[in-house]
């Protein structure tokens, strides 16, 4: 796995652990929580930084569903199980052998169940809405300056092929990121959306996962874009199965 | 040439916590993971647990978390394995080794837990 | 955790013979395999890193093989009687790292 073999750190996680004894004595970075080797030359699964995050909580988050089969993490943190390439595992139980089915980016797709649930296959998330709400500024920011920068930011930052930003939309003060990916369009080595969904909200929440990088300065034409709300909806290639008493609350 | 030091042997009475020690020289202390094995007579190795030196990051097998605590001293690029409350089931050969494949060995500490 | 499984639990050859061990994962580990000799009373010593890089100061003899799942494989090309020791295979895939049961070698 590469790293910076200079002084062995991985740019792209800081919660890492990095020792010169990889393979050939070569610098080799392992996620904490897991231990797990990480490609330090793109970003890591969201499910490997949950799992590193947890071995030093930090205050859980919650949000809040908008419609009928988007999905956002109302769950908050928790001590995922990862598979042997780092992605969720479908089911996902915690220590009191309760259990539940999640998508692609860890978020549940189904009520709790106990131990006897069973998840037959990790179902693709491949859709996401990054809604964010902007702080007040002297005029509406241009759309295609925006667009652009925020193209360039997921294209650069993040390492995201272009072809999976679908589309940027502006409303003052309100701005859509729309991120699509199908199961068909993501080749080997692509970064997931689902990834740099993740790597963004940690940037935004100035909790940048990147090691030694400033915090993300997001500037539209020399004007900075300060946001204050960020809300991230979630579409799977296969609907949630909720029971009616949980669409209904 | 790079060395891990252990002393020998070590006797302790039951329920006595006892801490073994791990000299390093040869290398970069903080730079490398020390592991922590065991070995009783007769029998395979049992990986306890790692620590990383440089910020005394840890890892436990699930099987010594309540029984062992791996610390380090930088300043003498020493690695310390702590049992809490020894029985005879403790009773082992304890061996400290660097990296993930671990390529340098201390000789180990026979630890006997004996009234 | 990883389980590996080593075996057979005794391997009995004559001087001269090529011989192998085995070690299997409970799941992909890729190369993330390495291998041990202990000779009685000695302390392990690395004998393969990483399923096949060859250490330094190990005779050429030794050798290894394999990835994934499947059989890894430890290779002794000519077996002789200072080879008399105990095998181990260990992974440093993830944590908690374990090791096979080991197997030992017995020369006639």
């Known amino acids: 796995h590469t790293a910076a073999q200079d002084n062995c750190t991985c740019p792209t996680n800081k919660m890492t652990v990095c020792s010169p004894d990889g393979p050939g004595g070569r610098c080799q970075c392992r996620a904490l929580g897991s231990g797990m080797a990480v490609d330090c030359s793109t970003l890591t699964s969201k499910c490997l930084l949950l799992k590193a995050r947890m071995s030093a909580p930090k205050n859980a988050r919650t949000l809040v569903r908008p419609s009928e089969h988007a999905l956002v993490d109302n769950d908050g943190l928790y001590d995922p199980d990862c598979d042997p390439e780092g992605r969720f595992k479908a089911r996902q139980c915690n220590q009191t052998s309760v259990c539940w089915c999640v998508n692609s980016v860890g978020v549940r797709r189904t009520d709790k169940g106990d131990l006897s649930l069973r998840c037959d296959e990790l179902v693709r998330t491949h859709h996401i809405l990054i809604d964010l709400r902007h702080r007040p500024t002297a005029g509406a920011f241009n759309h295609s300056d925006l667009d652009a920068e925020l193209r360039r930011l997921f294209r650069e930052r993040y390492r995201l092929h272009p072809k999976f930003v679908a589309a940027v939309h502006y409303e003052q003060p309100t701005i859509q990121i729309e991120l699509r990916q199908n199961t068909s369009q993501k080749a080997a080595g692509d970064v997931d959306i689902g990834d740099a969904a993740y790597y963004f909200e940690r940037d935004i929440k100035g909790e940048s996962l990147f090691q030694g990088r400033g915090g993300l300065d997001l500037r539209v034409r020399g004007e900075p874009l300060q946001v204050e709300r960020t809300l991230i909806y979630y579409l799977d290639e296969i609907p949630p199965k909720f029971s009616m008493k949980r669409l209904t609350a | 040439q790079v060395q891990l030091q252990q002393p020998g042997a070590e006797l302790v009475r039951p329920g006595a916590s006892v801490r073994l020690s791990c000299k390093s020289s040869g290398y970069t202390f903080t730079s490398y993971w020390i592991n922590w094995v065991k070995q009783r007579p007769g029998q395979g190795l049992e990986w306890i647990g790692n620590?990383?030196?440089?910020?005394?990051?840890?890892n436990y097998n699930q099987k010594f978390r309540d029984k062992a605590t791996l610390t380090v001293d930088k300043s003498s690029s020493t690695a310390y394995l702590q049992l809490s409350s020894p029985t005879s089931d403790d009773s082992a050969v304890y061996y400290c080794?660097?990296?993930?494949?671990?390529?340098?060995w201390g000789q180990g500490t026979a630890l006997t837990v004996s009234s | 955790d990883i389980l590996l499984t080593q075996s057979p639990a005794i391997l009995s050859v004559s001087p001269g013979e090529r011989v192998s061990f085995s070690c299997r994962a409970s799941q992909n580990i890729g190369t993330s395999i390495h291998w041990y000799q202990q000779r009685t009373n000695g302390s392990p010593r690395l004998l393969i890193s990483?399923?096949?890089?060859s250490i330094s100061g190990i005779p050429s003899r030794f050798s290894g093989s394999g990835s994934g799942t499947d059989f890894t494989l430890l290779i002794i090309n000519s077996v002789e009687s200072e080879d008399i020791a105990d095998y181990y295979c260990q992974h440093s895939y993830s944590w908690p790292f374990t090791f096979g049961s080991g197997t030992k070698l017995e020369v006639k």
């Open positions: 990483y399923a096949s890089e």
């Open positions: 080794t660097r990296g993930s494949g671990f390529d340098y």
């Open positions: 620590i990383f030196p440089s910020h005394s990051y840890t």
